[in-house]
């Protein structure tokens, strides 16, 4: 594959990499954050960065509780320069084909170009086309929300069912949950899993006369989505006198494949397209976000886009030392490759963000779960972290034990909005939530040594059980409020963190060949499940499982 974007094969070849290994040995692994605060009265001032959104709202990113000092930050920035992160970034923003294995541009950033500046792919300005799809989404969502768009019996639409998987599901699910406060007249449901339970349970609660189905599939060939879509269509027809003409009022497609959409029976006027330069996991900004626009209203959807656009502007225009996503990505590389950390925890102290870690899991792990560099050689270093998380304070009662006292380093991001959408009981709940947000980060940093434990009255064999090492790194992300603009900014922040990691590891963060093999084998096995014969074509384990399944099915 053609790769003209980087001039190194492996990150380990870069001089700053060796420098960082030495710094890790001499000071990184033994660094005491508590002592760093004592040594440098300006540490917080230097290591917290405030992002100002397009609407003037702010998000504070506090990196000061991380295992870094001035020298380490300087060496990490040197690494970013040597890896030419800014060069790759600029190539992405210019619409160049940085997805080298599929020879495609990576241009999700063009979807939130609300300034409507010219953005080119292969010599074509895509801004007008993006704008035209957004206008179509605005028009359609406003018609449906206002009741002007009616179902086949003349009733208003009350429910929207989005059928998609992966990028065509996770984004809209997460965003609609996160922005539930902004919901209006419609209920929205999401069907993703091929497990029949998912569609069956959804169809139990909706009315064919007032339901709009959105079939979300870039290719319109995704097995799970098309199977679920056909099931929905069959259910709809069976409830509506088997009249295919009714489909037009109740089915829309979010896809790039006009032929397949028409073949399915959807009027292509109700098709919302997007381009091949939009990757699935980056597609919530595109027509795939139609369910979001329907749920929270187009104006809020646009604010969501503008929040992301503001982070894009920050990422492209801010010097490296103050570049918030770049610093986030560099810290991730620091922990992953020098401390041997294998995971990254994202804990939103916000119930509305309960699907945010799942969304980031796909963003990060599908992007950077790669072993081959842009130079077509296998890496000799660790790449993509295992990202996980749950909302706090729930998480404090499950896996935080391991974060505090386990034998693994788990760099963590804590997210809180200062203003709750539900400031009930005179803000009592919000204050309790916030106190935990501050306390957890502090506890992970300061720990508790043997002397303190003994001073608190513990004796004998109990003492070591109550000791906390401290120096467990956290980044605290404090927003003013979770608004559409804030959420857009947070997602774009993590997109560019992921980009930065991938650029330093010199991997292609924009393909996903790893999902192919299982899909191919599933097709083969699917045919074998259609007959009653005993299967012997696989390994003994797979044969045994298939045959037992067939016996029990």
């Amino acid at each position: 594959s053609n790769n003209s974007f980087t001039n190194f094969k492996l990150a380990t070849e870069l001089p700053a990499w060796s420098k960082l290994q030495k710094i890790y040995e001499s000071q990184g692994k033994t660094l005491s954050v508590k002592q760093e605060f004592q040594k440098d009265a300006k540490r917080f001032e230097k290591l917290n960065k405030t992002f100002t959104n397009y609407d003037g709202s702010k998000i504070l990113f506090d990196y000061s509780k991380n295992l870094v000092n001035d020298e380490i930050i300087a060496a990490l920035i040197e690494l970013a320069k040597e890896a030419n992160v800014t060069g790759l970034r600029d190539a992405m923003f210019k619409g160049e084909h940085i997805n080298s294995t599929e020879d495609r541009a990576v241009y999700h950033v063009a979807l939130r170009n609300r300034a409507n500046k010219p953005m080119y792919v292969d010599g074509v300005n895509v801004a007008p086309e993006v704008d035209s799809v957004l206008k179509h989404m605005k028009e359609f969502s406003e018609q449906v929300r206002s009741g002007e768009w009616k179902g086949y019996t003349g009733k208003k639409i009350t429910d929207v069912v989005n059928i998609g998987i992966g990028g065509s599901d996770l984004g809209p699910v997460m965003v609609t949950e996160a922005l539930k406060h902004y919901a209006g007249v419609l209920d929205v449901h999401f069907v993703s899993n091929i497990d029949g339970t998912h569609i069956a349970e959804t169809l139990k609660v909706v009315d064919p006369e007032t339901t709009l189905f959105l079939i979300a599939s870039k290719t319109f060939t995704t097995a799970e989505t098309i199977t679920n879509a056909n099931t929905a269509k069959n259910w709809f027809l069976s409830k509506t006198g088997n009249d295919p003409s009714h489909i037009a009022k109740h089915f829309a497609a979010l896809s790039t494949n006009e032929t397949e959409v028409a073949k399915f029976g959807i009027d292509t006027k109700n098709m919302f397209g997007f381009e091949s330069w939009v990757g699935g996991r980056y597609s919530v900004w595109s027509a795939i976000g139609l369910s979001v626009a329907l749920y929270i209203g187009y104006d809020n959807f646009e604010a969501f886009l503008k929040g992301a656009e503001a982070v894009d502007n920050h990422f492209t225009q801010t010097p490296l030392e103050d570049n918030i996503p770049l610093l986030g990505g560099l810290l991730s590389v620091w922990y992953n490759n020098f401390f041997g950390a294998q995971t990254h925890l994202v804990a939103p102290f916000d119930q509305y963000l309960h699907r945010f870690p799942a969304y980031l899991q796909q963003l990060s792990m599908e992007s950077n779960g790669k072993s081959v560099t842009r130079g077509n050689v296998f890496t000799d270093y660790s790449t993509g972290s295992i990202l996980f998380g749950e909302p706090a304070t729930n998480a404090q009662h499950s896996f935080f034990q391991l974060v505090h006292q386990g034998t693994k380093l788990i760099p963590s991001d804590f997210i809180l909005a200062a203003q709750s959408h539900n400031p009930i009981e005179n803000k009592l709940h919000q204050k309790m939530l916030a106190s935990n947000f501050f306390a957890q980060a502090e506890a992970l940093m300061v720990g508790k040594d043997e002397e303190q434990v003994k001073a608190e009255g513990a004796t004998g064999g109990l003492v070591p059980h109550k000791v906390f090492s401290g120096n467990r790194p956290t980044t605290s992300i404090l927003a003013q409020k979770i608004t559409p603009a804030t959420l857009g900014a947070l997602i774009a922040y993590y997109e560019h963190v992921t980009f930065t990691e991938g650029a330093i590891w010199n991997i292609n963060s924009f393909d996903q060949w790893g999902v192919e093999l299982g899909k191919v084998l599933a097709k083969v096995i699917g045919k074998e499940l259609d007959n009653s014969s005993t299967i012997s074509t696989h390994d003994a384990s797979t044969n045994g499982l298939i045959n037992q399944f067939k016996e029990w099915m």
């Epitope: 040995e25 006292q405 043997e450």
Partner: nanobody, 122 residues
Framework: QVQLVESGGGLVQPGGSLRLSCAAS????????MAWYRQAPGKQRELVAV???????NYADSVSGRFTISRDNAKNTVYLQMNSLKPEDTAVYYC????????????????WGQGTQVTVSS
């Protein structure tokens, strides 16, 4: 890498004294327990004395009252003052340290020195 280097061994007459020292070098966060072990020819290695980071000490019955273990945390060094030496104290003396490698981790790794020979003979 962590290195432990012992010194101070040698030949001494019964009733005499020796002071062994062991210095830890390399990159680590801190040292938890530091200890001295010994191994006489044809015998198992046995614990002689141990000193915790808090300064608390423990001795084998055979050396109690004659040997004193101490440490200098600033120098990452442990000492063994051996008085009233007996022929049965003849052995190779090994320094052992339980080291906390990283600031964030409580897990201790075990490190040994190469050993220093102590011979008590007239």
């Amino acid at each position: 890498q962590v290195q432990l280097v012992e010194s101070g061994g040698g030949l001494v007459q019964p009733g005499g004294s020796l002071r062994l020292s062991c210095a830890a070098s390399g990159s680590f966060f801190n040292i938890n327990a530091m200890a001295w072990y010994r191994q006489a020819p044809g015998k198992q290695r046995e614990l002689v004395a141990v000193i915790a980071s808090s300064g608390r000490t423990n001795y084998a019955d055979s050396v109690s009252g004659r040997f004193t273990i101490s440490r200098d945390n600033a120098k990452n060094t442990v000492y063994l003052q051996m008085n009233s030496l007996k022929p049965e104290d003849t052995a190779v003396y090994y320094c052992n340290s339980k080291i906390r490698q990283a600031s964030w981790n409580l897990v201790l790794s075990d490190h040994w020195g190469q050993g220093t020979q102590v011979t008590v003979s007239s």
